[in-house]
Interface confidence: medium
């Protein structure tokens, strides 16, 4: 539909509340190191200028695109050249230029410090004396950390944070009702960040049909009794609405976000019969439910693949007439026959296909050259169930951190090059797989497993892009999307590595360790194991595992000393010779 | 739920044409494969044409290919099957079959329709 003017459109359709949000969101996401009250100034701005659009929507600049009205809002911060350097060169451009160029100066690793949690009577109080700045200032803090957060999701999730404090700030034990939901709402969000930055990485550099074929395989096993027709609807909505997220459209994405949701709930008798409870929810939680609801059951009776794909005469003919229509088919009959293979295996196996038809159709004989097509899916299928089988092993025994040590080692080893808190942040994720996954039945094994270490890589890929070092990264990177989990699994140790000097410093621990919770004194140990990994490449398990121990003892004795710096600085000494000793440094 | 519903049939000399209609309701016809088969007596359903839904692909059996047209037209959810230079072997009941989910696919294989109408007999004879 045309609208004289985009903005009072979109105003009227997500209503005040939610528009200043998304806006709030998009500008924290393009503009990441600026302060909050600048922020909310920009927005407060745009809000009264779309108000005067509703009232007339032939008033002056009421007609200009969004990209342009936000874009020359952005331009004004009187700051952009100090705090942004050559990202301020985006404001000589003309959209969609412009917009483009603001795009690729999103950082997803940018340098802000780490949000310290206050003391809960300090949040309650905030929470209290001003809601609505309170909330604000959440949705500014994960924004700019995560310029890629799925903004209507993020709507869902400050909903969440506002009713954690409506209900805790009450409670009599404000601290135990309030911390487990506010690190539930932190560890969720991560993941939920992670997700969809896969989806732009698949949008922004493999194109729109990697995405669709990731949304045809996706929601083939999701609905599978939903028809062909019906899943290819949804996968041009979805594609549609993530890449206006993706691409900064956010008033746009959300909007459309939700009238698919609309779209499917009107239409759940011929989507699936699990989509009633969702259904029944207001919207953002409504489209949250929708997106992860569970797998419907699969249609009894489902015919052979073989006899469409395989033994038809007209194998050839469709797929010459119409080729990504007849791959999608391909692809959807086998996500909906196999809810227990990750997408990407899917992907591999629908990629096969295609390359078999490709050279088959060209042959003398077509039938007898894809005859065996089927066959060839074999070791594709067997490769993840084979790995998966032996890193749940390897985790049953080991448990989670130790497990997150052993990947630490495999991928340092793998890629040295890359820095320490990315080797970290990555192989702790990695890590995180055995207790995401290990515990569900061999059927609900693989889509957990693979289809998370595929989100996990992405990160590696993304914060690897912004500073390579690394030929090997990059490679498996960019060659292919289904095939970044493979082609890191492949890699050998890198024989041309040279190993980095060695540096005391970086084994030097202070008292302060002591007052880490857990997850921090894990990371300090983790980040010790990389950088000995990077000394002596060629250590073996057996050397690092003493190493580590030692390092462990180390710890536990210093932090219950009297003199705690002194024995740090001491023992920590005697540590270092040792250790170098054990590893023939 | 797709009804299916044949007319058109009737006895034609040989040589001559007969335009045979299939009027769908329950779906649109364009969403689904849709095919012509026949049974002549005595004999299992034979496949005579076929098109995709979506993408409009035909199909036919090679013993009608240059003589049978099939065609659909949206608006009257209808599907059509124009059968010149008729000969005697072509006598046989006609059935117009439905596979919806499978837009592009026209199977050659009758048990791969789900939905079926009540047929209508086609007599070539002089």
């Known amino acids: 539909d045309a609208h004289k003017s985009e903005v009072a459109h979109r105003f009227k359709d997500l209503g005040e509340e939610n528009f200043k949000a998304l806006v709030l969101i998009a500008f924290a996401q393009y503009l990441q190191q600026c302060p909050f009250e600048d922020h909310v100034k920009l927005v407060n701005e745009v809000t009264e200028f779309a108000k005067t659009c509703v009232a007339d929507e032939s008033a002056e600049n009421c007609d200009k695109s969004l990209h342009t009205l936000f874009g020359d809002k952005l331009c004004t911060v009187a700051t952009l050249r100090e705090t942004y350097g050559e990202m301020a060169d985006c404001c000589a451009k003309q959209e969609p230029e412009r917009n483009e160029c603001f795009l690729q100066h999103k950082d997803d690793n940018p340098n802000l410090p780490r949000l310290v949690r206050p003391e809960v009577d300090v949040m309650c109080t905030a929470f209290h004396d001003n809601e609505e700045t309170f909330l604000k200032k959440y949705l500014y803090e994960i924004a700019r950390r995560h310029p890629y957060f799925y903004a209507p999701e993020l709507l869902f999730f400050a909903k969440r944070y506002k009713a954690a404090f409506t209900e805790c700030c009450q409670a009599a034990d404000k601290a135990a009702c309030l911390l487990p939901k506010l690190d539930e709402l932190r560890d969720e969000g991560k993941a939920s960040s992670a997700k969809q930055r896969l989806k732009c990485a698949s949008l922004q550099k493999f194109g729109e049909r990697a995405f669709k074929a990731w949304a045809v395989a996706r929601l083939s096993q999701r609905f599978p009794k939903a028809e062909f027709a019906e899943v290819s609807k949804l996968v041009t909505d979805l594609t549609k609405v993530h890449t206006e997220c993706c691409h900064g459209d956010l008033l746009e994405c959300a909007d459309d976000r939700a009238d698919l949701a609309k779209y499917i709930c009107e239409n759940q008798d011929s989507i699936s019969s699990k989509l009633k409870e969702c259904c029944e929810k207001p919207l953002l939680e409504k489209s949250h439910c929708i997106a992860e609801v569970e797998n419907d059951e699969m249609p009894a009776d489902l015919p052979s693949l073989a006899a469409d794909f395989v033994e038809s005469k007209d194998v050839c003919k469709n797929y010459a007439e119409a080729k990504d229509v007849f791959l999608g088919m391909f692809l959807y009959e086998y996500a909906r026959r196999h809810p227990d293979y990750s997408v990407v295996l899917l992907l591999r196996l629908a990629k096969t296909y295609e390359t078999t038809l490709e050279k088959c159709c060209a042959a003398a004989d077509p039938h007898e050259c894809y005859a065996k097509v089927f066959d060839e899916f074999k070791p594709l299928v067997e490769e993840p169930q084979n790995l998966i089988k032996q890193n749940c092993e390897l985790f049953e025994q080991l448990g989670e951190y130790k497990f997150q040590n052993a990947l630490l080692v495999r991928y340092t080893k793998k890629v040295p090059q890359v820095s320490t808190p990315t080797l970290v942040e990555v192989s702790r994720n990695l890590g995180k797989v055995g207790s995401k996954c290990c515990k569900h039945p061999e059927a609900k094994r693989m889509p957990c497993a693979e289809d998370y270490l595929s989100v996990v890589l992405n990160q590696l890929c993304v914060l690897h892009e912004k500073t390579p070092v690394s030929d090997r990264v990059t490679k498996c990177c960019t060659e292919s999307l289904v095939n970044r989990r493979p082609c890191f699994s492949a890699l050998e140790v890198d024989e041309t590595y040279v190993p980095k000097e060695f540096n005391a410093e970086t084994f030097t621990f202070h008292a302060d360790i002591c007052t880490l919770s857990e997850k921090e004194r894990q990371i300090k140990k983790q980040t010790a194991l990389v950088e000995l990994v990077k000394h002596k490449p060629k250590a073996t398990k057996e050397q690092l595992k003493a190493v580590m121990d030692d390092f462990a003892a180390f710890v536990e004795k210093c932090c219950k000393a009297d003199d705690k710096e002194t024995c740090f600085a001491e023992e920590g000494k005697k540590l270092v010779a040792a250790s170098q000793a054990a590893l023939g440094l | 739920e797709v009804q299916l519903l044949e007319s058109g049939g009737g006895l034609v000399q040989p040589g001559g044409s007969l335009r045979l209609s299939c009027a769908a309701s329950?779906?649109?016809?364009?969403?689904?494969?849709v095919a012509w088969f026949r049974q002549a007596p005595g004999k299992g359903r034979e496949f005579v044409a076929g098109?995709?839904?979506?993408?409009?692909?035909?199909y036919y059996a090679d013993s009608v290919k240059g003589r049978f047209t099939i065609s659909r037209d949206n608006s009257k959810n209808t599907l059509y099957l124009q059968m010149n230079s008729l000969r005697p072997e072509d006598t046989a009941v006609y059935y117009c079959?439905?596979?919806?989910?499978?837009?592009?696919?026209?199977?050659?294989?009758?048990?791969?329709?789900?939905?079926w109408g009540q047929g209508t007999l086609v007599t070539v004879s002089s």
């Open positions: 098109i995709g839904g979506g993408v409009d692909i035909t």
């Open positions: 079959a439905a596979r919806p989910g499978r837009p592009l696919i026209t199977s050659q294989v009758a048990d791969l329709y789900p939905y």
């Open positions: 329950g779906r649109y016809i364009d969403e689904t494969a």
